[in-house]
């Protein structure tokens, strides 16, 4: 369970909209497969689900950084700087270590989403049935 910090969720949402204009990220990419949404277990059901598993793992790595320890205590303090130009996302060089790490987690996931096919059958999947470890 990566327990994505709320503020990262809002910025992540906009990152996805940057690379996939017209998308509705909370509608499309929350509760998809075994890993898109809060938590995750089992084997990813498709490429998009793998993007989410990688994103979860990336957040788990972030939490191991000394500079990211505050994420465990007060996730609302977390934010980062980035820019969206066309459909290109750039994480700002002004970000500190933790912000830079998380920004890249979100950036890589958004790009991954943009390249992965979307399978409607995997939206709101029965995780108890299909996502057992």
């Amino acid at each position: 369970d990566s327990g994505i910090s709320p503020r990262a969720v809002w910025q992540f949402r906009k990152m996805i909209k940057c690379v996939i204009p017209g998308s509705d990220p909370f509608l499309e990419y929350n509760n998809y497969g075994c890993y898109c949404g809060l938590g995750g277990s089992g084997t990813p059901v498709d490429e998009l689900d793998k993007c989410c598993q990688t994103h979860d793992n990336c957040y788990d790595q972030a939490k191991k950084l000394d500079s990211c320890k505050f994420l465990l205590d007060n996730p609302y303090t977390h934010t980062y700087s980035y820019s969206c130009s066309g459909s290109a996302i750039t994480c700002s060089s002004k970000n500190k270590e933790c912000e830079a790490f998380i920004c890249n987690c979100d950036r890589n996931a958004a790009i991954c989403f943009s390249k992965a096919p979307y399978n409607k059958a995997h939206k709101n999947l029965d995780t108890k049935k299909y996502c057992q470890s």
Epitope: K17, F26, S83, C84
Partner: antibody, heavy 121, light 111 residues
Amino acid sequence: DVQVQESGPGLVKPSQTVSLNCTVTGHSITDDNYYWSWIRLVSGSKLEWIGYITSSGSTDINPSLKSRISITRDISKNQFFLHLNSVTAEDTATYYCARDSTDGDFYFEKWGQGTTLTVSS
Amino acid sequence: DIVLTQSPASLAVSLGQRATISCRASESVDNYGISFMHWYQQKPGQPPKLLIYRASNLESGIPARFSGSGSRTDFTLTINPVETDDVATYYCQQSSRDLFTFGGGTKLEIK
């Protein structure tokens, strides 16, 4: 401090095309991943989100209005515009431009004072 | 679309008493455990003013007399105690879906 100000023709005839302007001061509309929206107040009591243009220039329009509406911008003047085709009396409303929040969520922190559009023959 | 239904449409409250406004969503507005519901105050001739964001967070500069609560589909704006300056129309708004929608408004008057 960022400020937004709407302007428009005021009174127009049915079936005409209308353009409303929003002038932004204190912040570039191309910076910081803000989304710049048009919202209208119909019949003095119903708020309706019309659409937005993002800092990178992409747009999203309310599907119920999509066939008649476009949103554009002029970066050099730091303005964005609402273009409304084939207006009817139902488009009579106060039109606001607004900016979303500094934390990245889609609630509206900054509003203009509004411009009134009346459609009448 | 997520339809937001506010109740009552209007209410009259005595000065110093509590005003409670309800907003019900046609489907949950929660994502990642966060409620994407916001509240505004609008006075005649003025634009809406943000009061509460994400269900319960008080916007900077707004008096603590205003509070918000709720989750998923049921949300409440409370004003306690009501003051003369609170006469206005109050709106809820959801940002859970990218088609942002507002409630129909609740007009608050002083008894």
